[in-house]
Amino acid sequence: AGVFELQIHSFGPGPGPGAPRSPCSARLPCRLFFRVCLKPGLSEEAAESPCALGAALSARGPVYTEQPGAPAPDLPLPDGLLQVPFRDAWPGTFSFIIETWREELGDQIGGPAWSLLARVAGRRRLAAGGPWARDIQRAGAWELRFSYRARCEPPAVGTACTRLCRPRSAPSRCGPGLRPCAPLEDECEAPLVCRAGCSPEHGFCEQPGECRCLEGWTGPLCTVPVSTSSCLSPRGPSSATTGCLVPGPGPCDGNPCANGGSCSETPRSFECTCPRGFYGLRCEVSGVTCADGPCFNGGLCVGGADPDSAYICHCPPGFQGSNCEKRVDRCSLQPCRNGGLCLDLGHALRCRCRAGFAGPRCEHDLDDCAGRACANGGTCVEGGGAHRCSCALGFGGRDCRERADPCAARPCAHGGRCYAHFSGLVCACAPGYMGARCEFPVHPDGASALPAAPPGLRPGDPQRYL
């Protein structure tokens, strides 16, 4: 038995460009906390697989409010260590996930809101009883600096916390068959009595009275080689008598790693690198159940209790992801129409509508053409939050109720005189100009700069604007 200890040193922007925005603001103060998840072996650190070695949550850090305009600094951290107790042996190799969570402390409806800021993961080899190991991990633009160690709880000692120690009976040496607990410790390994007759060379025990066999040996006392055949077997053991040189089976022969795991030989055993979703010494364990508490942020877990059945997290409003770990910025979907301002209140969305619009999403135009008529043959056109009338010729105003003076805008160029006409206006052009608006000069030789005037109209005649 023992304790894994994690000390967070700093959490802040990593080096390089693209510094992250501070997660807290004057409007929305927040504080950080951390979660660590440990798994045995060197399997993939799938965030979804359970924390078989244990997990721990830190205290909340100090409340932090961003200084306007300042870059995100290293954020204030919770006090103390994260401690993950382990009951059995320390595995020596382990995977970790460290999550940095933000707790928002603004005027939240229904309590504080949590969101995952960063998640780092890794695989490490660590002997219990060793010094603090320092590490730096990056997640996006964030950088996490931390140290960790594993220590045994007395009377357990050793790199796996499996040996029990007691003071030496003699000053210089331990009893027969016992070794020092560590080269410099003044204690000896306590004797562990295995099953009577258990092979001292090929068997061992972790509990009194048992006899567990080392690789290549079997039988109740571990005295029987797994392969007793001679060199006729392609994987048979070496035989000094026949001069056979075929090596015995390796630990990865036949691939002991299940579920597509890959095997590599270690100095005395083997190691499985497991595909995502599997873990365990041989990648034999799969699936996550609701018993593992995989849903964050108040998500409701639905699923069977057996390892083979999947689980589903039903997320509360404002959260998403397979584990409800992601805070949804629902305003990013721009749900408010017609330029309305979106407000995410956590429990609900609110749209603040511009003048002239209404409805939950500002979808209703208050000044639309419904029930409104444009007089004198005008047609109603919607747009911009207000209706307008496109008036028939000779009429104007908001509802086309006013008679228009077609000459008010002085449409005839070059001193031409304007006459109102029932079908519009007529320009009487000054000498030397022609065209519907008297816009074209007439050349001195009488030739027009344009194609000849329509039949029946001479230069200088009033031009009717149709």
């Epitope: 020596g92 190799t93 890794g122 695989r123 490490r124 080899r125 660590l126 002997a127 060793g130 010094p131 050793g158 790199t159 796996a160 070794r179 560590a182 001292p200 060379e201 090929h202 080392l214 690789e215 290549g216 090596p247 015995g248 590599s264 030989e265 270690t266 100095p267 005395r268 055993s269 190691e271």
Partner: antibody
Framework: QITLKESGPTLVKPTQTLTLTCTFS??????????VGWIRQPPGKALEWLAH???????RYSPSLKSRLTITKDTSKNQVVLTMTNMDPVDTATYYC????????????????WGQGTLVTVSS | DIQMTQSPSSLSASVGDRVTITCSAS?????MYWYQQKPGKAPKLLIY???NLASGVPSRFSGSGSGTDFTLTISSLQPEDFATYYC?????????FGQGTKLEIK
């Protein structure tokens, strides 16, 4: 005092089998946590691990040479024997044996004592 | 296979200098082991389990690192330190050594 000494032929012909013996004193391969390994070093080149054997007869071989290597121990004689078949001139090297210690099930603590080495030349 | 890359491959320094040799593994190895070898001699263990000094090794030698990047430091070079240094990993088979760093007198 812990010592290790390699012995075997200094010259072997191509295709022949090399048998090297490591004789050690000051520790026993019947003691839990003890192992003996073989390492070689071609002239002017880096070290290359070949194989090792533990007190409980767990063995490891370099994958690239596995089909040619066999390691055995004789606990009563304090000896470890390495056999390498089908020798080739590229196998010319100084061959070392060394003690390996593991105070944990699968973590090597140290390869702390080495023999003086024996130069093996492969030539016809 | 885990490749071990030492840098520099060779290094000239003077007595009293502080020297750093790095070893980079192609994948995480967690522990590193360092050896010193002089011409015509067997390698000698210097550092085991990354930072532990082997018996009889002077305290001017130190080891550090984690994951894939490890360092051997000699705080103040002595005449007897001029040799070739090797790193090694015991994580997975084959248990590979670095190509060596030759430390020479400037």
């Amino acid at each position: 005092q812990i010592t290790l000494k390699e012995s075997g032929p200094t010259l072997v012909k191509p295709t022949q089998t090399l048998t090297l013996t490591c004789t050690f004193s000051g520790f026993s391969l019947s003691t839990s946590g003890m192992g003996v390994g073989w390492i070689r070093q071609p002239p002017g080149k880096a070290l290359e691990w070949l194989a090792h054997i533990w007190w409980d007869d767990v063995k490891r071989y370099s994958p690239s040479l596995k089909s040619r290597l066999t390691i055995t121990k004789d606990t009563s004689k304090n000896q470890v024997v390495l056999t390498m078949t089908n020798m080739d001139p590229v196998d010319t090297a100084t061959y070392y044996c060394a003690r390996i210690v593991s105070f944990d099930n699968d973590v090597v603590s140290a390869m702390d004592y080495w023999g003086q080495g024996t130069l093996v030349t492969v030539s016809s | 296979d885990i490749q071990m890359t030492q840098s520099p491959s060779s290094l000239s320094a003077s007595v009293g200098d502080r020297v750093t040799i790095t070893c980079s593994a192609s994948s995480s190895v967690s522990y590193m082991y360092w050896y010193q070898q002089k011409p015509g001699k067997a390698p000698k263990l210097l550092i085991y389990l990354t930072h532990n000094l082997a018996s009889g090794v002077p305290s001017r030698f130190s080891g550090s690192g984690s994951g894939t990047d490890f360092t051997l430091t000699i705080s103040s070079l002595q005449p007897e330190d001029f040799a070739t240094y090797y790193c090694q990993q015991w994580r997975s088979n084959p248990f590979t050594f670095g190509q060596g760093t030759k430390l020479e007198i400037k």
